[in-house]
């Protein structure tokens, strides 16, 4: 069905055309599947194109940035949003993603996130580290997530909400599912994977796959011949 093609294959979806094409501009609505409407900015800008970097969510920005309207501190406010430099310790904040790595937002102020001072179950937000196309469930560069998880002494199991792959138990990675990020199994040899054509092209990402496991790389399946280059099947293969 069209549904399964668009959002139910285990891959990050690249639905609208790149920036400059016929796709929606920031703030437009994009239909991702029959019966579903996704509204958000165009997520196809690359790292090395023009500045400032447009965004719809914190997760589209770099490690030391958050997504916001230039004149406002909070994301989600009307107008075009761009990636802004993160806020250092003791600066005002409205959410964890606004604070620089190693800090979190408490009572409107960026504080050092020394876990020893956080009570068990305290909610803390961090950064998802994507190590590259073969080692990240996303676009191949570090980015923030606006979602959170609770700090537990045990690692997240399959289906647990997470911030980063290190929150998940061995053999799992942190990847998007619907409007959350959860722990999912790392891919094994022969399983279908997602290889992005260029940095930054992470599409709508309603569903993300994990990266390929150790010793594996996401490559075009040799016996998979298709007329369209863009629809070539990638699988996890031995180096």
């Amino acid at each position: 069905t069209l549904n399964s093609v668009l959002i139910n294959s285990n891959a990050i979806k690249n639905l609208p055309p790149p920036l400059g094409g016929a796709g929606g501009q920031p703030g437009s609505a994009v239909s991702v599947a029959p019966g579903v409407l996704y509204e958000g900015g165009n997520k196809y800008q690359t790292l090395d194109n023009y500045q400032p970097y447009p965004c719809a969510e914190d997760e589209e920005c770099g490690t030391d940035e958050y997504c916001s309207s230039p004149s406002r501190g909070a994301a989600g406010v009307g107008g075009v949003q761009i990636c802004l430099a993160c806020r250092k310790r003791r600066k005002r904040c409205m959410r964890h993603a606004m604070c620089c790595p190693g800090n979190y937002c408490k009572n409107g102020i960026c504080m050092p996130s020394d876990h020893s001072h956080l009570p068990r179950g305290e909610i803390e937000e961090g950064i998802i580290e994507n190590l590259g196309n073969d080692h990240g469930a996303g676009d191949g560069y570090p980015r923030r997530t606006t979602l959170t998880s609770k700090i537990y002494h045990t690692k997240g199991q399959e289906g647990s909400v997470c911030l980063r792959s290190s929150d998940c138990a061995t053999g799992l990675c942190c990847a998007r599912h619907f409007w959350s990020k959860i722990c999912k199994p790392v891919l094994k040899e022969g399983q279908v994977c997602t290889k992005h054509r260029r940095k930054g092209s992470h599409g709508l990402e309603i569903f993300q796959r994990c990266y390929c496991g150790e010793g594996l790389a996401c490559r075009i399946q040799k016996d998979h011949h298709q007329t369209s280059n863009s629809s070539r099947l990638h699988t996890c293969q031995r180096h």
């Epitope: 549904n3 959002i7 139910n8 285990n10 991702v32 599947a33 019966g35 579903v36 409407l37 996704y38 509204e39 958000g40 719809a56 969510e57 914190d58 997760e59 997504c67 909070a74 994301a75 989600g76 409205m94 959410r95 964890h96 993603a97 937002c105 909610i123 937000e125 997530t145 606006t146 979602l147 959170t148 998880s149 609770k150 399959e158 289906g159 647990s160 909400v161 990847a175 599912h177 619907f178 409007w179 959350s180 959860i182 999912k184 199994p185 309603i206 569903f207 796959r209 994990c210």
Partner: antibody, heavy 117, light 111 residues
């Protein structure tokens, strides 16, 4: 303690509008995706809308163009603006979130809407 | 959309006995190595409460009496031993595909 408290329900005529609110506390609201789910008088549960922490919004066809989900991350409130209401929109409306796993593990008590002339 | 069919629509079980509710999906809800099937309990005048997620994992504070099983398109919720307090409606729900959908519900009564 996590709390979700809905308000704004009531009786409205077909074609009318209504805005629901969901006040959240006990967690860092701005970092979590939020959803609205409704339950019809026949007890059928239906997903109505969701919004990510960054403000991206998602709707099923049944409410697309009529309902708008939004959030105020300063006041910790989730909204559902409903317009062009129909009799089939009559339901108990719940706000829900996923704090520990992908499923909706925290729900409010709900607010009732009746669309009738 | 994925359609979930629950059976039976209602059942009455004696105190201490086993109650089993079935949920069949119109297509597999397995993806990413996870079965995206959840179970909720709803008592009169209350919102739904998450019992089981990922087919068999228990939600926070859910007693071990509630067990979920199954994969693909066939799932079940088992309550054993059944207690008086378990009188409620039980719903299955899939989170594999957008839109998330719910089963029609099963009404459990304790004899």
């Amino acid at each position: 303690e996590v709390k979700l408290v809905e308000s704004g329900g009531g009786l409205v005529k077909p074609g009318g509008s209504l805005k629901l609110s969901c006040a959240a506390s006990g967690f860092t609201f701005s970092n979590y995706a939020m959803s609205w789910v409704r339950q019809t008088p026949e007890k059928r549960l239906e997903w109505v809308a969701s919004i990510s922490g960054g403000g991206d919004t998602y709707y099923p066809d049944s409410v697309k163009g009529r309902f708008t989900i939004s959030r105020d991350n300063v006041r910790n409130i989730l909204y559902l603006q409903m317009s062009s209401l129909r009799s089939e929109d009559t339901a108990m409306y719940y706000c829900a979130t996923s704090l520990e796993n992908y499923a909706m593990d925290y729900w409010g008590q709900g607010t009732s809407i009746t669309v009738s002339s | 959309d994925i359609v979930l069919t629950q059976s039976p629509a209602s059942l009455a079980v004696s105190l201490g006995q086993r109650a089993t509710i079935s949920c069949r999906a119109s297509e597999s809800v397995d993806d990413f190595g996870i079965s995206f099937m959840n179970w909720f309990q709803q008592k009169p005048g209350q919102p739904p409460k998450l019992l089981i997620y990922a087919a068999s994992k228990q939600g926070s504070g859910v007693p071990a009496r509630f067990r979920g099983s199954g994969s693909g398109s066939d799932f079940s919720l088992t309550i054993h031993p059944v207690e008086e307090d378990d009188t409620a409606m039980y719903f299955c729900q899939q989170s594999k595909e957008v839109p998330p959908t719910f089963g029609g519900g099963t009404k459990l009564e304790i004899k």
